[in-house]
């Protein structure tokens, strides 16, 4: 106890009132109004609560404190008077600050400040929103992801910043007086083939196909090592060449001389080279057969094997490179007679006349071609005099129904040695190459050396066998007259074609040999 | 008739790039390739590579490779070089020539000098 | 690469003379060329494919051989001839020339 009269006890927040009594400060309570233990204690009283009667008047906040409160201008208001606190509803001059005025980059990039009482927001521009995470921060709205799907299928979505575009897709272009860019925009598909935007190789045939387009092969070509066919970028190679090579066991310098020269020509072969490649192949031809060389010394079955090569091989190398060639009429010459006639058109509907200076063809355009084949139609012939060296005494091989006719009434008539060639050996060509059945026949006119009397002449093809030989055979091939130096035959299939004379005597009009016509 | 005509001459700084023309007139341009041919002063004919107008192809000596860029522009019927990283020894006459493999090469152009000087 | 070897380097020879140099390749070739360049002027085709002379060639020139062995021949020299003769192979890439053949005037 205190001398003086005090207590010395008094909890913390009061004061005493004589030496067995405390009072709480202004600002706290106790239980009671008097405190007369030390147990008791004096709370903060909270005028701010509701039910209190401090009123600090609006667009301000009561703040309790320790044993007392202040009033302050709530967030987004601000005192005319300067006073950051004040006690009471007089006191109060709270009005609202325009934050927009104050800081002009409130709302950051594409977004417009807005005043509110106490308060701003941000209004973003046409294209962007609000950011959930940052409300004062716009950001561009993808229209393009945000499921308004707002372009049409033809088109794709390009969003940029604020805005988005729909723009034809690769390989489209705008309908015919459709933007391209805004949400209107209607797009078809681009032929890149008839306009000439493809990249395909010379090499390749341009196919379009939905939104792009591709390259394959041409026919007759393969795409080369490593790269795959239908690609933009496939380039192809030309296989005439690769395939017409030497012939298996026949060993001859002059023939090796020849594949080398073919194989050179198709190294570094190109389409545009197509004509300049023909006369080239023509030529070593030529040479070949008027300077046979060795080949003269191989055995005549091998001679054989050798000209059933040449003769299959320049059927389909022609053939291929003349797909090659533009659209007319191509005659060439060499010095040994080998002679090519050549004709090169879009499909017509007439029939065609190929003219030499030993022979002549006449055929139906319409055989030319194989349907869906969107390459030109090509009808050729070649006259190959020379290959008459290596044909000499090759076999003819008749029919079995006809030879049996001919042993029953000509027994012995046939032993007389190998048929004489009387003709150039002439090959016929299509741009088709499925020429074994001719919807309408091929005529052909030869001329000839002068037939020897009571001897009977015979339209012949070159027949190729398994063994990769061959034989003259009638099968398919009719005379439909002969004079002294010219015969004329029709055939159904196109191949390799000659005019042989029999070595046996011809009967007045006897029946059994217009049979084997 | 065939003619191969070449640019003028060029005087070029060590480390340049020239670009020589060779303007084909008179056949089907794609019928043939372009050739390139150097002849050093006093030197024989090396091939330098050929392109083919039809498709762009190239094709190139190993030595020239990265060296001489061949192009052709089919619409004014015009084969270019390029010859880059130029040193003295690039000094030459360089020639066009259409070729064919079976008919080498039968039209030559003029030849074109180029000089390599600092 | 296909080499080809020209020999002899330079000869000489007079007006009426026969002329022969050869082209050796070091592998086989098919297509042989021979072209006849002048002192500043651009090299002209003289003999394509072996033997066949090119357009306005004088048939005095001519050209044989086979695999790696080619001959071009001056069956009578005219002044007009002295100039240096290349041979070139379009057998195998890349394209070479030989070095050259230079005929001068004895």
């Known amino acids: 106890q205190d001398s003086r009269g005090c207590a010395r006890w008094c909890p913390q927040d009061s004061s005493c009132v004589n030496a067995t009594a405390c009072r709480c400060n202004p600002g706290f309570s106790s239980f009671s109004e008097i405190i007369t233990t030390p147990m008791e204690t004096c709370d903060d009283i909270n005028e701010c609560a509701t039910l209190s009667k401090v009123s600090c008047g609006k667009f301000s906040d009561c703040w309790n404190t320790e044993g007392s409160y202040d009033c302050v201008c709530s967030p987004g208001y601000e005192p005319v008077s300067g006073a950051k606190t004040f006690k009471n509803e007089s006191e109060n001059t709270c009005q609202d600050v325009d934050e927009c005025q104050q800081n002009p980059r409130l709302c950051k990039s594409y977004g417009t400040c807005v005043n509110t009482l106490g308060s701003y927001t941000c209004q973003c521009l046409p294209g962007f929103k609000l950011k959930p995470e940052d409300p004062k921060l716009c950001t561009d709205v993808n229209e393009c992801t945000s499921g308004q799907n707002p372009c049409h299928s033809s088109t794709h979505c390009l969003n940029n910043v604020g805005s988005y575009q729909c723009r034809c897709r690769p390989g489209w272009q705008p309908i015919p007086g459709s933007p391209n860019g805004p949400n209107n925009t209607v797009c078809e598909d681009v032929d890149e083939c008839s306009s000439g935007q493809h990249q395909c190789d010379s090499s390749t045939v341009c196919f379009n196909t939905v939104g792009s387009y591709s390259c394959r092969c041409r026919p007759g070509w393969k795409p080369r090592h490593g790269i795959p066919n239908n690609q933009k970028d496939t380039v192809c190679e030309d296989m005439t060449f690769s395939t017409w090579t030497p012939p298996p066991g026949v060993h001859s310098q002059t023939l090796s001389r020849f594949f080398d020269k073919v194989q050179d020509l198709g190294r570094d072969y190109k389409p545009g080279l197509a004509n300049n490649t023909i006369q080239s192949i023509l030529q070593a031809l030529d040479e070949l057969l008027e300077a046979p060389g060795d080949l003269e010394t191989l055995p005549r079955l091998q001679q054989h094997c050798v000209a059933s090569h040449l003769l299959d091989g320049l059927e389909d190398v022609l053939r291929g490179l003349s797909k090659n060639l533009s659209n007319g009429l191509l005659n060439f010459s060499y010095p040994a007679g080998t002679e090519l006639s050549l004709e090169v058109q879009k499909q017509v509907d007439r029939s065609v006349t190929l003219r030499q200076n030993q022979a002549v063809m006449q055929l139906d355009w319409n055989q030319a071609q194989k349907s869906g084949d969107p390459g030109p139609s090509v009808v050729g012939l070649v006259s190959i005099p020379g290959m008459g060296k290596l044909l000499a005494e090759a076999p003819l091989v008749l029919e079995p129904e006809k030879q049996m006719l001919l042993h029953e009434t000509h027994q012995g008539l046939l032993q007389d040695g190998s048929p004489i060639l009387l003709s150039d050996v002439i090959s016929a060509f299509l741009s088709n190459n499925d020429t074994q059945n001719l919807s309408s026949p091929v005529t052909f006119t030869f001329s000839h050396r002068s037939v020897i009397p009571r001897q009977k002449v015979l339209c012949v093809f070159w027949e190729h066998g398994q063994n990769g030989c061959g034989h003259w055979a009638t099968t398919g091939c009719s005379t439909i007259g002969t004079r002294d130096t010219s015969t004329i035959c029709r055939c159904t299939h196109l191949s390799s074609f000659a005019v042989l004379m029999a070595h046996y005597d011809v009967q007045e009009e006897d029946p059994v040999l217009t049979v084997i016509t | 008739q065939v003619q191969l005509q070449q640019s003028g001459a060029e005087v070029a700084k060590p480390g340049a790039s020239v670009k020589l023309s060779c303007k084909a007139s008179?056949?089907?341009?794609?019928?043939?390739?372009m050739q390139w041919i150097k002849q050093a002063p006093g030197q024989g004919l090396e091939w330098i590579g050929a392109?083919?107008?039809?498709?762009?192809?190239?094709r190139h000596t190993q030595k020239f490779k990265g060296k001489a860029t061949l192009t052709a522009d089919k619409s004014t019927s015009t084969a270019y070089m390029e010859v880059s990283s130029l040193r003295s020894e690039d000094t030459a006459v360089y020639y066009c020539a259409r070729g064919f493999t079976a008919y080498g090469m039968d039209y030559w152009g003029q030849g074109t000098t180029v000089t390599v000087s600092s | 690469e296909i080499v080809l070897t020209q020999s002899p380097a330079t000869m000489s020879a007079s007006p009426g003379e026969r002329v022969t140099m050869s082209c050796s390749a070091s592998s086989s070739v098919s297509y042989m060329h021979w072209y006849q360049q002048k002192s500043g002027q651009s090299p002209k085709r003289w003999i394509y494919?072996?033997?066949k002379l090119a357009s306005g060639v004088p048939a005095r020139f001519s050209g044989s051989g086979s695999g790696t062995d080619y001959t071009f021949t001056i069956s009578s020299m005219e002044p007009e001839d002295f100039a240096t003769y290349y041979c070139q192979q379009w057998s195998s890439n890349p394209l070479t020339f030989g070095g050259g053949t230079k005929l001068e005037i004895k």
């Open positions: 494919d072996t033997s």
């Open positions: 008179g056949y089907t341009f794609t019928n043939y390739w």
């Open positions: 392109v083919y107008p039809g498709d762009g192809d190239t």
